[in-house]
């Protein structure tokens, strides 16, 4: 399955939208920083078969979509930007789902992939827990927004590596 160029452009658009969604300057929220321990090794496309990498990407975007689809998220962000952002993520999920179905037929996905998906889920659990602990404060959301921008940039790089493998 060839991930279309439009998928990468969609990821870029999602990053731009997420950047525009900010409401307070990150400079004002330095004290709220948190290390969510992004599972960087899961974004290293070299150690994965293509099917594994695509399912990790899918999980990453699915979890991001879920995070920004909550009521708390709706209250935190400007509605039209949030809708555009969610639409971009939804489109990417459709692209990736088509690829997952295609690729899983070609390759058997080993157990190692379940570990990778679990690592991504735990990462998002840490983010959700942080928001709960900080009572969904504006600065807590700002920290999370910056973190998701970072993780989306990792997934963009993984997509680039996948395209180079084709």
């Amino acid at each position: 399955c060839d991930l279309p160029q439009t998928h990468s452009l969609g990821n870029r658009r999602a990053l731009i939208l997420l950047g525009q969604m900010g409401r307070i300057s990150p400079f004002s929220c330095l004290k709220d920083r948190h290390d969510f321990r992004i599972p960087q090794e899961e974004f290293d496309g070299n150690q994965f078969q293509k099917a594994q990498a695509i399912s990790v990407l899918h999980e990453m975007i699915q979890q991001t979509f879920n995070l920004f689809s909550t009521e708390d998220s709706s209250a935190a962000w400007e509605q039209s930007l949030l809708e555009k952002f969610s639409t971009e993520l939804y489109q990417q999920l459709n692209d990736l789902e088509a690829c997952v179905i295609q690729e899983v037929g070609v390759e058997e996905t080993p157990l190692m992939n379940e570990d990778s998906i679990l690592a991504v889920r735990k990462y998002f659990q840490r983010i959700t827990l942080y928001l709960i602990e900080r009572k969904y404060s504006p600065c807590a959301w700002e920290v999370v927004r910056a973190e998701i921008m970072r993780s989306l940039s990792f997934s963009t790089n993984l997509q680039k590596r996948l395209r180079r493998k084709d």
Partner: antibody, heavy 121, light 107 residues
Framework: QVQLVQSGAEVKKPGSSVKVSCKAS????????ISWVRQAPGQGLEWMGG????????NYAQKFQGRVTITADESTSTAYMELSSLRSEDTAVYYC??????????????WGQGTLVTVSS | DIQMTQSPSSLSASVGDRVTITCRAS??????LNWYQQKPGKAPKLLIY???SLQSGVPSRFSGSGSGTDFTLTISSLQPEDFATYYC?????????FGQGTKVEIK
Amino acid sequence: QVQLVQSGAEVKKPGSSVKVSCKASGGTFSSYAISWVRQAPGQGLEWMGGIIPIFGTANYAQKFQGRVTITADESTSTAYMELSSLRSEDTAVYYCARHLEYAFPDKFDYWGQGTLVTVSS
Amino acid sequence: DIQMTQSPSSLSASVGDRVTITCRASQSISSYLNWYQQKPGKAPKLLIYFASSLQSGVPSRFSGSGSGTDFTLTISSLQPEDFATYYCQQSYSTPLTFGQGTKVEIK
């Protein structure tokens, strides 16, 4: 390769304004923070404020609030620092410094070459 | 504002010496401390971030430690190119503030 190239040296009269530019290349200009740091002759470093272009609003050190304006032009990947009501104590080398992409603006990873601003009557 | 105090303000040392510079914050800053090196007429260069993480490309003879209010920069074996001024900087809160600097000179 990340590069920050600043405008040339300036000589200004007390009471006037100066606008220093900082052109960035490498990385995605809109998504990282740029700060301005100054250094008076033989003195230490002083943070003036910073901006994240994609975000638009700048954050300033209280000391410079009302006298400094930091802006960014995404179309040219250039950040600007304008300091008004200049006095002799503002004579310094002014640096722009870039923070890491998609990270909180806490450390200065890349620096411009510096712009000497001399305030003298 | 958080005040950063470095000591000593200057020191003389020889090539091969072990050099230690300390930095104290006026309040707890967790591990949000960075160290920079500056040579005359040049822009500062990041050496250490988050108190003890070595910036990419920086020689391993540089190391940082500490948390809370007290921090240390150590150069395990001073090299000719290490003679410069060193600054600590807190990134716990704005305004971001620097120490006054420590000048490392040749003995």
